[in-house]
Amino acid sequence: DGPAGSWEQLIQERRSHEVNPAAHLTGANSSLTGSGGPLLWETQLGLAFLRGLSYHDGALVVTKAGYYYIYSKVQLGGVGCPLGLASTITHGLYKRTPRYPEELELLVSQQSPCGRATSSSRVWWDSSFLGGVVHLEAGEEVVVRVLDERLVRLRDGTRSYFGAFMV
Amino acid sequence: DGPAGSWEQLIQERRSHEVNPAAHLTGANSSLTGSGGPLLWETQLGLAFLRGLSYHDGALVVTKAGYYYIYSKVQLGGVGCPLGLASTITHGLYKRTPRYPEELELLVSQQSPCGRATSSSRVWWDSSFLGGVVHLEAGEEVVVRVLDERLVRLRDGTRSYFGAFMV
Amino acid sequence: DGPAGSWEQLIQERRSHEVNPAAHLTGANSSLTGSGGPLLWETQLGLAFLRGLSYHDGALVVTKAGYYYIYSKVQLGGVGCPLGLASTITHGLYKRTPRYPEELELLVSQQSPCGRATSSSRVWWDSSFLGGVVHLEAGEEVVVRVLDERLVRLRDGTRSYFGAFMV
């Protein structure tokens, strides 16, 4: 392309660079639905924001294709553990794409935090962090799931969260 | 703005892009003060560096406003656990801003690692990682706190650290 | 440099910016060699990719010098723990450089997950995540090691992985 075209592309890139897609969504009282769906998130209040990404029913929705570092942390805790709970808690980031009917696992962790109660207390806390780079197309969505979500502890948006930025 | 202005901005952006703010600070013998203050960090030796950010008394200080991925890991460990310590260890990243008198929680984890000793050995190890994107204004500071900091294990700067980069 | 030179540099930067180095490698059946070497990774199938970085025998190889956010997660698990296993599992990212004969520790975690089995089950799961910014020169390599690697659980590339991107 000629110099004018290159110039336009550079200007374009500068502007788009100013809004390199990024988001950080935070846990809220409404995050845990108990419906078997993904966790829901706060998108505006406090530390939460969306920049060049959108949100729909728990999902970060990609508007610009590319490689994204996606991450999530969940705060787990309890007083003992519910009976019948498998000794595994699964925390994962999953992709929804129009090209495939089922969610695809992207990044997943399994933990057994219920064995972490101290001798002095049946109370236990644990935290699970996931982060990694994935390619996402425009229109694709990423969600967070935790099984068993009853063990997710929400407070003020600082302990359980979900985010992404283009790399 | 005219082409000359645009050109200048592009040149400027190229230069600033070369120094996209980033930092990685490492744990050192002096990190744990026992004073109730934040952890202190090595800023120059070994793997530690500052690029487009500054440091003051444990804090990463922002010089250029924007969205930053901030992160910290702390290595926890002990031989048994002190009583009087709640069964929770809290590891957090906190913001100090001239516009507000108190530190603001950004990213926080709670863990109960003391219940993790094996049957006969009282030795336990655990690690806590935090990372997420937050908006920071020029002059704002981010610090790391761990309660109870007696359980933080320092060695060579690879196990406990604190960093950030602009996204 | 004159305007033509600046223009060339900008064009160059735009093109290189398009391929900001990034990679995400995933765990596979062949990852655990039992040979005492680093973990091996899938580089092409599924979620795995290399962009502006190369791969050799478990190592991410840097082609363009700069600051990189490097990360790794490993899924740990077992039914009890092997006898004689120290109560510590070490998960680390290490640098190989032509300028030094030994690997250098970059980011390391120690954990005692074997104490995490619940009272009703000897099964335990745990996850270790590492991430941080390091400076890497062209030709330098980064590898992942886990001691004892017998406790690493592989499945589908979502639970144990290794990646990097330039910041």
Epitope: S119 | G77, V79, C81, P82, L83, S121, R122, R155 | -
Partner: antibody, heavy 120, light 111 residues
Framework: EVKLEESGAELVKPGASVRLSCKTS????????VYWVKQRPGQGLEWIGE????????NFNEKFKSKATLTVDKSSSTAYMHLSSLTSEDSAVYYC?????????????WGQGTSVTVSS | DIVMTQSPASLAVSLGQRATISCKAS??????????MNWYQQKPGQPPKLLIY???HLDSGIPARFSASGSGTDFTLNIHPVEEEDAATYYC?????????FGSGTKLEIK
């Protein structure tokens, strides 16, 4: 001033049981484990076990599991050890001690000891 | 259980001289750079008294003539210069693994 005051000497018959007390003062009772240690006449020291005063959770040396019961009364900052089915092997001085985590779980304060003699 | 082997069983040292007591653990008692080894002094009719914690740290109120060192499995208690009041039995003890175990004791006599 940190103090651990133990109950007086006991003379008991074989097969009987005894309860020893350890009243603490001068520190926050719930902030330190209480350990119990046995010393037979002219012999060395044996760690019996510990109790967490916060919730009364005990942890024993396997050797003493069926012999000793450890309890606490938080209201009086007192720890107790109950020894059952006594035999001559149980004749010893029993010490309660405070464990200091900051000192690497060392026993930094000791009671004066309670002498238990098992004899018919 | 970790076995603590203390030597000698007894020793006689002249006033003002050095007394050295050794303690060997059947496995390492180190954690993160610290040895979880403690030393106690016991005089007849009295409870033991803590002298040294975490291999080399002097408890408060203990005179500086007491010192200790070691790591891993091998630890040493030194008293120099020995004084009359140091006549006692000395015990080492590990505090890293259940059950906590003591050495068999070293009886120090002052000549």
């Amino acid at each position: 001033e940190v103090k651990l005051e133990e109950s007086g000497a006991e003379l008991v018959k074989p097969g009987a049981s005894v309860r020893l007390s350890c009243k603490t003062s001068g520190y926050t009772f719930t902030n330190y484990y209480v350990y119990w240690v046995k010393q037979r006449p002219g012999q060395g020291l044996e760690w019996i076990g510990e109790i967490n005063p916060t919730n009364g959770d005990p942890n024993f040396n396997e050797k003493f599991k069926s012999k000793a019961t450890l309890t606490v009364d938080k209201s009086s900052s007192t720890a107790y050890m109950h020894l059952s089915s006594l035999t001559s092997e149980d004749s010893a001085v029993y010490y309660c001690t405070r464990s200091n985590w900051d000192y690497g779980n060392a026993m930094d304060f000791w009671g004066q000891g309670t002498s238990v003699t098992v004899s018919s | 259980d970790i076995v603590m082997t203390q030597s000698p069983a007894s020793l006689a040292v002249s006033l003002g001289q050095r007394a050295t007591i050794s303690c060997k653990a059947s496995q390492s008692v180190d954690f993160d750079g610290d040895g979880y080894m403690n030393w106690y002094q016991q005089k007849p009719g009295q409870p033991p008294k803590l002298l040294i914690y975490k291999a080399s740290h002097l408890d408060s109120g203990i005179p500086a003539r007491f010192s200790a060192s070691g790591s891993g499995t091998d630890f040493t208690l030194n008293i120099h210069p020995v004084e009359e009041e140091d006549a006692a039995t000395y015990y080492c003890q590990q505090s890293i693994e259940d059950p906590f175990t003591f050495g068999s004791g070293t009886k120090l006599e002052i000549k």
